[in-house]
């Protein structure tokens, strides 16, 4: 699986999840998030060669098409597969609010 | 929606579904598919600017991160959203077989 366990431990050129730390204030300009100050959102990148973690029959076919027709511009792309939530603390006026934001952290990738 | 109705009628640089006809024999080297001779598989391509058909909270955050940090290499990617099946005819020996292949035709795209 192209997950953090594998990808963070290997120098992988092809589609894999990559570490990306986002500081809410510095990187997004968000002052409203009180805690955490930032988090590992991660992202997916890298080429999708033939048969690499193909998501659907279409991505399998497109991967073969791209392999046999290298001049073609159509190829699968490396995108998030499994995502996890992130719990944040923010304030509405002086009232603290705890919210679980869904699909905030990429844990694995696929070729789609 | 970034679907064939919109994308095929507009000169759209950003993420959209693009027409791609695949000839089974010429493009994939598949002699085994008897009918059809080929089909419009289509594909997704184009940049994913901030808020363009974002798939998840992560892709929204990543789009904003990319907009505010243009030097960053992390950005959402344009990939299939809705796919449709394709019915094919092939032979096993002299016996004709009709099969509906799922997820073969891209009808719309998203930024993921």
């Amino acid at each position: 699986a192209l997950d953090t366990n594998y990808c963070f431990r290997n120098l992988e050129e092809n589609c894999c999840v990559r570490p990306l730390y986002i500081d809410f204030r510095q990187d997004l300009g968000w002052k409203w998030v009180h805690e955490p100050k930032g988090y590992y959102a991660n992202f997916c990148s890298g080429p999708c060669p033939y048969l690499r973690s193909a998501d659907t029959t279409h991505s399998t076919v497109l991967g073969l098409y791209n392999t046999l027709n290298p001049e073609a511009s159509a190829s699968p792309c490396c995108v998030p597969q499994d995502l996890e939530p992130l719990t944040i603390l923010y304030y509405v006026g002086r009232t603290p609010k705890v919210e679980q934001l869904s699909n905030m952290v990429v844990k694995s990738c696929k070729c789609s | 929606a970034l679907d064939t109705n919109y994308c095929f009628r507009n000169l759209e640089e950003n993420c959209c579904v693009r027409p791609l006809y695949i000839d089974f024999r010429q493009d994939l080297g598949w002699k085994w598919v008897h009918e059809p001779k080929g089909y419009y598989a289509n594909f997704c391509s184009g940049p994913c600017p901030y808020l363009r058909s974002a798939d998840t909270t992560h892709s929204t955050v990543l789009g904003l991160y990319n907009t505010l940090n243009p030097e960053a290499s992390a950005s959402p990617c344009c990939v299939p959203q809705d796919l449709e099946p394709l019915t094919i005819l092939y032979y096993v020996g002299r016996t004709p077989k009709v099969e509906q292949l799922s997820n073969m035709v891209v009808k719309s795209c998203k930024c993921s």
Epitope: L64 | L28, W30, K31, W32, Y90, V92, K97, L101, S102
Partner: nanobody, 118 residues
Framework: EVQVVESGGAAVQPGESLRLSCAAS????????MGWFRQAPGKQREMVAI???????NYADSVKGRFTISRDATKNTVYLQMNSLNPGDTAVYYC????????????WGQGTQVTVSS
């Protein structure tokens, strides 16, 4: 049950040749795109060559001009002829069969070891 079985791996010297064979179940062979992949110690599995039922082929840049993939439908077998072998070709070689009927599936063999050393 679908089976993919490789054979022909051996230890050879640089410059020598070797032919690998891969037998696949007849139930899938005629519709399958067959491929040879390899995995060297500490490296990722990479594509070496593929061949479709219609004879379309593609090779990794590192083996172009040295390796040839072919298939024999009468024997449900795919071959990889490897010439001018060098130490960089040392790896476990895996055969696979991609078929999309009745559903999209990839079948892998167990692998065969090729070692090139003087």
């Amino acid at each position: 049950e679908v089976q993919v079985v490789e054979s022909g791996g051996a230890a050879v010297q640089p410059g020598e040749s070797l032919r690998l064979s891969c037998a696949a179940s007849g139930s899938i062979f005629n519709t399958a795109t067959m491929g040879w992949f390899r995995q060297a110690p500490g490296k990722q599995r990479e594509m070496v060559a593929i061949i479709t039922d219609g004879g379309r082929t593609n090779y990794a840049d590192s083996v172009k001009g040295r390796f040839t993939i072919s298939r024999d439908a009468t024997k449900n077998t795919v071959y990889l002829q490897m010439n001018s072998l060098n130490p960089g070709d040392t790896a476990v070689y895996y055969c696979n069969a991609l078929t999309i009927v009745p559903r999209s599936s990839i079948y892998w063999g167990q692998g065969t070891q090729v070692t090139v050393s003087s």
